[in-house]
Interface confidence: medium
Amino acid sequence: NKDNEGDGLVDCLDPDCCLQSACQNSLLCRGSRDPLDIIQQGQTDWPAVKSFYDRIKLLAGKDSTHIIPGENPFNSSLVSLIRGQVVTTDGTPLVGVNVSFVKYPKYGYTITRQDGTFDLIANGGASLTLHFERAPFMSQERTVWLPWNSFYAMDTLVMKTEENSIPSCDLSGFVRPDPIIISSPLSTFFSAAPGQNPIVPETQVLHEEIELPGSNVKLRYLSSRTAGYKSLLKITMTQSTVPLNLIRVHLMVAVEGHLFQKSFQASPNLAYTFIWDKTDAYGQRVYGLSDAVVSVGFEYETCPSLILWEKRTALLQGFELDPSNLGGWSLDKHHILNVKSGILHKGTGENQFLTQQPAIITSIMGNGRRRSISCPSCNGLAEGNKLLAPVALAVGIDGSLYVGDFNYIRRIFPSRNVTSILELRNKEFKHSNNPAHKYYLAVDPVSGSLYVSDTNSRRIYRVKSLSGTKDLAGNSEVVAGTGEQCLPFDEARCGDGGKAIDATLMSPRGIAVDKNGLMYFVDATMIRKVDQNGIISTLLGSNDLTAVRPLSCDSSMDVAQVRLEWPTDLAVNPMDNSLYVLENNVILRITENHQVSIIAGRPMHCQVPGIDYSLSKLAIHSALESASAIAISHTGVLYITETDEKKINRLRQVTTNGEICLLAGAASDCDCKNDVNCNCYSGDDAYATDAILNSPSSLAVAPDGTIYIADLGNIRIRAVSKNKPVLNAFNQ
């Protein structure tokens, strides 16, 4: 019973003793099998470009690194891989920690290895909670919201033997990081005359050419196609002035399962160049393009227990397929297509990145004609299936698209079949000239449940069965709101602190659910929250008719300082669990520690006369016009629809670097609302930027990055997706 290091840990409970022979056989000192061994044993050279699942599938099994008790529970098209490390408070890697899934025992478990690392496969698209347990430490839980088909690098987890209270901090004065990320340019460039210009300046690539006598074929060489050519990421973490009291700057870069971590003493113009060797965490070559997640954290002297993190994504180029296999040389007329990544590697040295070309738009449902209100043939193939008034959208954790189509909520399965799952009944329908009764949909990433925020009935509903039922109108239950309207200065504070089903609401609109299952919804000028126990509270605003406060133009505010005028839509960013609010042509971000800042749009009081705010590339200096809906992708990209119902009907995107650009919806040269001869539908199966939309009412993003638009005026659901090679029936 010896505590050698004075760290309170005795015998084999202490990971430092695990190297001693007496502890070698202790379960606390043994981890799961090393994934590197498993992958390398089962590695095949063909095909060079494997699907994500094929790269990692060997890691799960009865005798693998991720132990599954029964049948393989994973969907090959949805899986992701969680990688992380567990350490003790002094930074010692912790072996023998059992890591399992809360609520999903069939997903199995793993045990951290000697270096404290672990690997777990899970179905993505959903939010999962991991449970960490090892004697004598306090067990912990961590929630992760997983994308599809990618690695998820979890922050290092520190296990403690006792709970120590973290003092609360006033964050209102702290400046958050605003890193600038520049990745090395994609190697699209090549020199037409290598003899004269052997170096491609943008990428520092050496280029050579040899003519083959007696033929019109040339041999070409590019140093960028060699194994030693790495991808670079330049990260600027601080600007010329450093915020007051900033003591340390933390950096994390996650790419293909690698997690790089470093911390720096605070200083001006702090920069770091991250070098990626184009392999994944298991040493497998990565072909095509990969998303790197860069996190920069600020640690302040007055609040050492808290690091303020900001995340950005950047694109890094992996290995290129070699068309000719001639020791780094290729025949200039011999090309090879990476179908999975959508890259054409030419023998000339040029690369054509199809996914970097403008996105493509298609119609996945609707044909421009309205269905009848009774919806007799609502079920079947989605394509061409008529709609009445698509007003709300949400994406399910399996990739299903839920469509709020006036009086029916309809589910488009990944198979592209559609089924009605809820009928919304109202005697008023027969008196309505405007079928766009507005309600909002949201999916809980934890349970997959679908919620309906209905302004008219002042209630929030949960759909009971997502696969449909005979009783479509009875397929919902109230989760918030009595139907009674909460009036200003209500003594009961509209039910705050009590059960949400007993609360009174004012005017529920946009709704979103975060990775922990907390539901947020707009209620008049407030944003309200329902916790996992069904208790309601107000996150932002009040019902006391307090005057709207002008938003801070360029600095963050505490949530208690903010009073909104007319918020409409909400979205949660899966990357950092922050809540985004659409309010009067401005999009606000509320971080998990309740700091509010503008992400896109320029409030009127912040605009300087004489400056054209429609031209700015920066989202926070760009004016939004009649913004109608927002959504956020798993890579943190914000999407905004704007419509004046006349000439402006578009979708714009804001990257994690804060740049805004048009993604879909060309300006119409006539008035879609008032001119009956104005053609406001066009562009399917072509570039989305050239397509014409008509009153886009709602937005949703799937985990694979496909953006769905409820094109209300055109009575269609449009899908905007990356430009990729299309395979025929023979997979060619």
């Epitope: 009086n407 919304l424 009944r425 109202n426 005697k427 008023e428 008196h431 009764h437 309600y439 209905d454 008219n456 009935s457 002042r458 209630r459 509903y461 005979k470 009783d471 479509l472 109108a473 009875g474 919902s476 139907g483 009674e484 309207q485 009036l487």
Partner: antibody, heavy 123, light 107 residues
Framework: QVQLVQSGAEVKKPGASVKVSCKAS????????INWVRQATGQGLEWMGW????????GYAQKFQGRVTMTRNTSIRTAYMELSSLRSEDTAVYYC????????????????WGQGTTVTVSS | DIQMTQSPSSLSASVGDRVTITCRAS??????LNWYQQKPGKAPNLLIY???SLQSGVPSRFSGSGSGTVFTLTISSLQPEDFATYYC?????????FGPGTKVDFK
């Protein structure tokens, strides 16, 4: 508390009209439908129609079409049901009842009822 | 119009008895069925909505079930205050229609 208070009993001659009032309190009047239901002595309940106090929209049972008019005065939170061309078989207790109007989900039933107004039609 | 029928039209029971009343619709009404209790000289009182949901404030001894065309109201243990007339009502489509009622009296 939430309640509906109706006007007092009426005695009318055949061919006349009667107008029954229903005053709401304890809740937001414009948020909920008002339904009218009648019950002849010793008989069952008979639904006459509904009115949305917010929009003024109405829906009447075919049997009463052309004879019944449902209106409201939102400023005094009162709904009215007027039945014309009265006949002896219209003798009944007339109830107003609250239903969850303004909602997609209108099938929740009538959760608050007035005390009833007795209308007697007799020559 | 949708016709509603109830059975039995009356029944005699004792305190503590389990009582079941059946309501039938002339066509499928999904689960749009409500149950009311009415005592002599009083207005009806909503007990159950959408076939099986208990109205707040109603004792848990009352329960409802069924969908489509056949529905039941069950009182698990009859109490003295439960002697009354019970009506079913469909709200699937207008005109809303009531059943003729079932009178529960003392045995």
């Amino acid at each position: 508390q939430v309640q509906l208070v109706q006007s007092g009993a009426e005695v009318k001659k055949p061919g006349a009209s009667v107008k029954v009032s229903c005053k709401a309190s304890g809740y937001t009047f414009t948020n909920y439908d008002i339904n009218w239901v009648r019950q002849a002595t010793g008989q069952g309940l008979e639904w006459m129609g509904w009115m949305n106090p917010n929009s003024g929209n109405t829906g009447y049972a075919q049997k009463f079409q052309g004879r019944v008019t449902m209106t409201r005065n939102t400023s005094i939170r009162t709904a009215y049901m007027e039945l014309s061309s009265l006949r002896s078989e219209d003798t009944a207790v007339y109830y107003c009842a609250r239903g969850p109007g303004g909602s997609f989900y209108y099938y929740y039933g009538m959760d608050v009822w007035g005390q009833g107004t007795t209308v007697t039609v007799s020559s | 119009d949708i016709q509603m029928t109830q059975s039995p039209s009356s029944l005699s029971a004792s305190v503590g008895d389990r009582v079941t009343i059946t309501c039938r619709a002339s066509q499928s009404i999904s689960s749009y069925l409500n149950w009311y209790q009415q005592k002599p000289g009083k207005a009806p009182n909503l007990l159950i909505y959408t076939a099986s949901s208990l109205q707040s404030g109603v004792p848990s001894r009352f329960s409802g079930s069924g969908s489509g065309t056949v529905f039941t109201l069950t009182i698990s243990s009859l109490q003295p205050e439960d002697f009354a007339t019970y009506y079913c009502q469909q709200s699937s489509s207008t005109p809303f229609t009531f059943g003729p009622g079932t009178k529960v009296d003392f045995k």
